[in-house]
């Protein structure tokens, strides 16, 4: 009895850019090939249970078949590799989810304020929707000291209130990093003395 998978798909957890091309490879295990009397010619690729046309397949060798998608437009694709076995039955080999999205844009319009007696809060424009989990981190430093990063919360991704106490009469440099599975970008740096950003109660 074949309990473990008959093969695998590479890459296993792909995150791809929307409207880009993507190739997946299904590799059959030899014991599975022997058991079912098949090779890579017998692989059937499916997305969300629909069979992909054979024109999109490439037989790499006796054990491996690839499928190529052009201009991916869906955010979430269930891709399965199956083999045609006895009596034209299909046996699932392996499945993956292709997640699509966009890399983050460079954050813009970074500005900070210090509410009197409170800690500094900065906000920015995070840019377009990426359809992916995108983390924004506010970075700040003096010429001689790096402050703790301020990680924006998921529900307020375009602002962050720092943990450290504000120090006045010394210039601070502040910028934002945006990162997701498709890339990492940094905003322009701003340089200011927090005393000029104080907002009276």
């Amino acid at each position: 009895e074949l309990l473990d998978p008959c093969g695998y798909i590479s890459p296993e957890s792909p995150v791809v850019q929307l409207h880009s091309n993507f190739t997946a490879v299904c590799v059959l295990k030899e014991k599975c090939m022997d058991y079912f009397h098949v090779n890579a010619n017998y692989i059937v690729w499916k997305t969300n249970h629909f069979t992909i046309p054979k024109e999109q397949y490439t037989i790499i060798n006796r054990t491996a078949s690839s499928v190529t998608f052009t201009d991916i437009a869906s955010l979430n694709i269930q891709l399965t590799c199956n083999i045609l076995t006895f009596g034209q039955l299909e046996q699932n080999v392996y499945g993956i989810t292709i997640i699509s999205g966009l890399p983050p844009e460079k954050p813009k319009n970074l500005s900070c304020i210090v509410n009197e007696g409170k800690k500094m809060r900065c906000e920015w424009d995070g840019g377009r929707e990426t359809h992916l989990e995108t983390n924004f981190t506010l970075k700040s430093e003096w010429a001689t000291h790096k402050f703790a990063d301020c990680k924006a919360k998921r529900d307020t991704p375009t602002s962050c209130t720092v943990d450290y106490s504000t120090v006045y009469f010394v210039n601070i440099e502040v910028w934002v990093e945006a990162e997701n599975a498709l890339g990492k970008v940094t905003s322009d740096h701003i340089n200011f003395d927090p005393v000029y950003k104080v907002k009276p109660n």
């Epitope: 030899e30 090939m33 022997d34 079912f36 009397h37 098949v38 090779n39 890579a40 010619n41 017998y42 037989i59 060798n61 006796r62 045609l84 006895f86 034209q88």
Partner: antibody, heavy 119, light 108 residues
């Protein structure tokens, strides 16, 4: 015990076609592939193409593309190899063989069919 | 396509000799290498498949080894009926499968 029995020798004129048959007996070829290999006089073995009955697909060596057609009649377990636009260099013994899908070895062979192309 | 190169192209040996034929692939083919014996006027006969597995009914004096690009067919003690032409064949690519050019084994 699988046996592959091929049709008899053929003498053909240049430009004509030849169709060689290969009948399987003593076993099913449902899960196997039928491969055609040829051997010119005094030469080595040359792969021509393969048919995969369960998929209804045939694959051909590039040099034969457009001239070679491999078909299968599953009701009679007979494979056919048709080569068109024959030339003198197609004179050879043509073999069919059962290919094991998983490993790609040819474990049963037909006896061979000599095709002579001569004007 | 994957090219297969056999060496030597011919060799002379005596009954009882140990004989080795080599086959080299132009790229790695894992263990997808098969060996055939062909006698004049006859169809080839499978001897070894998957580089080292002996086909049913083939005498144990035949053995195969190797993986990747370099493979060997060995006949441990040559018998009169072993004088024939031997071919290696790769089945890693599918299609096409490809054969070596053959090694003719003659009586010394």
């Amino acid at each position: 015990q699988v046996q592959l029995v091929q049709s008899g020798p053929e003498v053909k004129k240049p430009g004509s076609s030849v169709k060689v048959s290969c009948k399987a007996s003593g076993g099913t070829i449902d899960r196997n592939e039928i491969t055609w290999v040829r051997q010119a006089p005094g030469q080595g073995l040359e792969w021509m193409g393969v048919i995969i009955p369960i998929l209804g697909e045939a694959h051909y060596e590039r040099k034969f593309q457009g001239r070679l057609t491999i078909t299968m009649d599953e009701s009679t377990s007979t494979a056919y190899m048709e080569l068109s636009n024959l030339r003198s260099e197609d004179t050879a013994v043509y073999y069919c063989a059962r290919e094991r899908a998983a490993r790609g070895y040819l474990d049963y062979w037909g006896q061979g069919t000599l095709v002579t192309v001569s004007s | 396509d994957i090219q297969m190169t056999q060496s030597p192209s011919s060799l002379s040996a005596s009954v009882g000799d140990r004989v080795t034929i080599t086959c080299r692939a132009s790229q790695s083919i894992s263990s997808y290498l098969n060996w055939y014996q062909q006698k004049p006027g006859k169809a080839p006969k499978l001897l070894i498949y998957a580089a080292s597995s002996l086909q049913s009914g083939v005498p144990s004096r035949f053995s195969g080894s190797g993986s990747g690009t370099d493979f060997t067919l060995t006949i441990s003690s040559l018998q009169p009926e072993d004088f024939a032409t031997y071919y290696c064949q790769q089945s890693y690519s599918t299609p096409p499968i490809t054969f070596g050019q053959g090694t003719r084994l003659e009586i010394k």
